[in-house]
Amino acid sequence: GGTAEKWEETELDQLFSGPLPGRLPVNHRPFSAPHSSRDQLPPPQTGRSHPAHTAAPQVTSTASKLLPPVAFNHTIGHIVLSEHKNVKFNCSINIPNTYQETAGISWWKDGKELLGAHHSITQFYPDEEGVSIIALFSIASVQRSDNGSYFCKMKVNNREIVSDPIYVEVQGLPYFIKQPESVNVTRNTAFNLTCQAVGPPEPVNIFWVQNSSRVNEKPERSPSVLTVPGLTETAVFSCEAHNDKGLTVSKGVHINIKVIPSPPTEVHILNSTAHSILVSWVPGFDGYSPLQNCSIQVKEADRLSNGSVMVFNTSASPHLYEIQQLQALANYSIAVSCRNEIGWSAVSPWILASTTEGAPSVAPLNITVFLNESNNILDIRWTKPPIKRQDGELVGYRISHVWESAGTYKELSEEVSQNGSWAQIPVQIHNATCTVRIAAITKGGIGPFSEPVNIIIPEHSKVDYAPSSTPAPGNTDSM
């Protein structure tokens, strides 16, 4: 027989409801009544002295008919105990001397053999008729994961004998499967919190706590939903789960009231060009509501009048925006504001930023091209374009000259300094057409090219006068 014990009872004979079995009658499986410990339960078939059927070992020897059937003695069927308690239970079997081969008893839980980390002891009690074997199993400080169906296995004459199961049901303090979660809510707007805890043992009752004070006087059965009609300031909520074993308290969760965001900070200029400024910022506190978009406000700093503010909207992320369509070489004041579902933040502190000088907006004028055949050069002249302040300081010109003749095409360019308004370039090909275009250059870049001017380059030494340039078709500039 066998039963389960509290841990403190360590003597072997205390594992049984009666004295240790010496030689039990063959095929008799006594039921041992459980001890009075409240953490033990009897088998499902209370009062049964032996099963209707037992699995008798198969023996292949000629004496098999003489071998009585062997089975594990009936043991306790169900143990209910509290988490962190200690438990012992056992299997026992009587093997008559007629059985020659027996292997050790192994313990199994939910179909898997228990190896290593578990504490089991097997004791043998021989007498003149055979041997009684008792396998003791103990678990120190049981956890919920120790829940399960335990049974013993043993090989006798190469036949596997399996005990009836011992169901171990671990009860403990309530265990949360759903705890309240932090939420951010609109001021004075109702919201729900959910708390669910389970045993065993059931039932589990829930009390809600707000800022250390109980919300509900009467407990609610788990799961519980708390409807809060609305808050005006941040609060901390938790739930208490109670069962017969005691109390478990959930984590405390902050319920925050959504407000407008704080203004962005650290507005920086990452890059400037003549017509754009790349600005970055660090978002302010989001006011417990995700930032939806941001607004970049731009005004000209130089204007005496309260110049109109340009507003550029962008997504809240990334915290970066390229302001475009600005004037070159101009000063701007820039600030950023962001919004969440509640509203717009105040604007960040204003910062100053400048665009760089631009490229010229007009091409050089009055371009003329003369062929100096004796020196085999082109003489090119132009007048300086009217460059605005924001176009920057003139640093030079780029002259593009393209040479075309039958089967030959050559595209070249020269850069000349701003001193003077003329240049000379060597003739590249005779019996060809040369097309010349000129653009002004400032630190802000290269401006537009002039309309093309064409000049025909005759064959070498066939002409005794110096031809002048002819405007390209559609060009009305004088030669």
Epitope: P44, T46, G111, F151, P165
Partner: antibody, heavy 118, light 112 residues
């Protein structure tokens, strides 16, 4: 998840036998008792008995000894109940159910209808 | 055998009402260790029985908190605090303290 899938309805003649099955899944079949329950049309429930598949031990309600035979095939995780010498009194829906750790019949099969008619 | 007497046989209720079902055993269902193996089941039309309450007062997983069980020894009660349409069916008690296990005769919960 734990499931018990029973075989389909049976129409059998008086005096014959029928064997109905209950295939378990979602848990260790050899570790938990399987119980069988009878329900006659419009009537209550009658407990037939149990089998522990791990060792094939059985326990019967005296009322059903000689009528029902419980077996189990661990290789297919299937429990069987054979009903013999059938009469119209045996016409019923038969359920298999698992005895869970909480020592209650926690999961049930969908039932097998047996009709005994000549 | 432990005879389980269940009352009433039929229980007409209005939705939202409380319902109470009694189950009485011919012998005590309390074990020597203090546990009592009395369980409650609901069988909806055309379905298998489903476990509601185990060992007198423990709600099985997934069972609504409208269901509660109480009692000891030989007298047990199942209460449904606010009956909903999905609660309709036949309620059984089952004892597994003594062999053979025995069921109550059933209580049919129906709409008035």
């Amino acid at each position: 998840q734990v499931q018990l899938q029973q075989s389909g309805p049976e129409l059998v003649k008086p005096g014959t036998s029928v064997k109905i099955s209950c295939k378990a899944s979602g848990y260790s079949f050899t570790s938990y008792y399987i119980h069988w329950v009878k329900q006659r049309p419009g009537q209550g429930l009658d407990w037939i008995g149990w089998i522990f598949p791990g060792n094939r031990n059985t326990q019967y309600n005296e009322k059903f000894k000689g009528k029902a035979t419980l077996t189990a095939d661990t290789s297919s995780s299937t429990a069987y109940m054979q009903l013999s010498s059938l009469t119209s009194e045996d016409s019923a829906v038969y359920y298999c159910a698992r005895l869970g750790l909480i020592y209650a019949l926690d999961y049930w099969g969908q039932g097998t209808s047996v009709t005994v008619s000549s | 055998d432990a005879v389980m007497t269940q009352t009433p046989l039929s229980l007409p209720v209005s939705l939202g009402d409380q319902a109470s079902i009694s189950c009485r055993s011919s012998q005590s269902l309390e074990n020597s260790n203090g546990h009592t193996y009395l369980h409650w089941y609901l069988q909806k039309p055309g379905q298998s029985p489903q476990l509601l309450i185990y060992r007198v007062s423990n709600r099985f997983s997934g069972v609504q908190d409208r269901f509660s069980g109480s009692g000891s020894g030989t007298d047990f009660t199942l209460k449904i605090s606010r009956v909903e349409a999905e609660d309709l069916g036949v309620y059984f008690c089952l004892q597994v303290t003594h062999v053979p296990f025995t069921f109550g005769s059933g209580t049919k919960l129906e709409i008035k």
